[in-house]
């Protein structure tokens, strides 16, 4: 392991569309990949009238946008589908939304997912 880097070996897995996709609904997913590539966890969710609906969680590929992020945080302003990624085992268990706004101070909207 490289000093100071959290290596990702497994992530929380969730698929809201599990019946159609014929996968498990939830579990722990081992993350594979080439030895020279970094691995990450991700979470995607929707905000339907203030209610959080998780879409997918799992392992993600080597992505510079995820490097050295121990927390899973979406920074885009009001996307249709929220996405965050992070490094470290099961780092996608919790995710949050901190929109990057030019003028106003970002507000914390932490989410602790509770899959059905």
């Amino acid at each position: 392991a490289i000093l100071g880097r959290s290596e990702t070996q497994e992530c929380l897995f969730f698929n809201a569309n599990w019946e159609k996709d014929r996968t498990n609904q939830t579990g722990v997913e081992p993350c594979y990949g080439d030895k020279d590539k970094r691995r990450h966890c991700f979470a995607t969710w929707k905000n339907i009238s203030g209610s959080i609906e998780i879409v997918k969680q799992g392992c993600w590929l080597d992505d510079i946008n995820c490097y050295d992020r121990t927390d899973c945080v979406e920074k885009k302003d009001s996307p249709e589908v929220y996405f965050c990624c992070c490094e470290g085992n099961m780092c996608n268990e919790k995710f949050s939304y901190f929109p990057e706004m030019e003028v106003t101070q970002p507000t914390s909207n932490p989410v602790t997912p509770k899959p059905p």
Epitope: R22, Y32, F42, K46, G58, C59, Y82
Partner: antibody, heavy 119, light 107 residues
Framework: EVQLLESGGGLVQPGGSLRLYCAAS????????MSWVRQAPGKGLEWVSA????????YYADSVKGRFTISRDNSKNTLYLQMNSLRAEDTAVYYC????????????WGQGTLVTVSS | DIQMTQSPSSLSASVGDRVTITCRAS??????LNWYQQKPGKAPKLLIY???VLQSGVPSRFSGSGSGTDFTLTISSLQPEDFATYYC?????????FGGGTKVEIK
């Protein structure tokens, strides 16, 4: 070096069957999901089918569901596509491609094998 | 199924030109958008995944952007070897779908 080599293509009559093979090397085959993608002459890419690394989960495009069956033998590092009830519109170059995890892209592709369905 | 619409279907450009190809998804696909390059008689090659991440070995003149439903592939300065057909693809759904392709031809 990652290599994917398709075989089994050829000329078949409408209603006939064909089995395609994809021999994989240079990576841990069982750790990757695999897909078949086809391209009709002069047309774009069409995803056909996919299978998880373990082989437990399979997925099909509506256009081939019930006629094609994807399978794999991880001990032989080989992916298969059994094609039954073939139609003229199934004529295409068939590519196999690997995918690390379900939301990932298809990062390596074979060179393809041509299937021609004609009487 | 998620539909992917690419435009234009073809374009003519000269070496050194800046080229932009767009791809629209019929529903939000987050960052699960990939771009491929295909040359005649060859297999497709992965260029970009996750909207903007360059696959190993892909020149930095290629870039990707967008989010949600609207995405863009940009070639900052077209090179002779870039004349090819480009496809977008969504991997948000387990049932993959590709755009119809954009053929980049020499003007």
């Amino acid at each position: 070096e990652v290599q994917l080599l398709e075989s089994g293509g050829g000329l078949v009559q409408p209603g006939g069957s064909l089995r395609l093979y994809c021999a994989a090397s240079g990576f841990t085959f069982g750790a990757y999901a695999m897909s078949w993608v086809r391209q009709a002459p002069g047309k774009g890419l069409e995803w056909v089918s996919a299978i998880s690394g373990s082989g437990d989960d399979t997925y099909y495009a509506d256009s081939v569901k019930g006629r094609f069956t994807i399978s794999r033998d991880n001990s032989k590092n080989t992916l298969y596509l059994q094609m039954n009830s073939l139609r003229a519109e199934d004529t295409a170059v068939y590519y196999c491609a690997r995918q690390l995890i379900p939301p990932a892209p298809l990062d390596y592709w074979g060179q393809g094998t041509l299937v021609t369905v004609s009487s | 199924d998620i539909q992917m619409t690419q435009s234009p279907s073809s374009l003519s450009a000269s070496v050194g030109d800046r080229v932009t190809i767009t791809c629209r998804a019929s529903q939000g696909i987050s960052r699960f958008l990939n771009w491929y390059q295909q040359k005649p008689g060859k297999a497709p090659k992965l260029l970009i995944y996750g909207v903007s991440v360059l696959q190993s070995g892909v020149p930095s003149r290629f870039s990707g952007s967008g989010s949600g439903t609207d995405f863009t592939l940009t070639i900052s300065s077209l090179q002779p070897e870039d004349f090819a057909t480009y496809y977008c693809q969504q991997s948000f759904s387990s049932l993959f779908t590709f755009g119809g392709g954009t053929k980049v031809e020499i003007k």
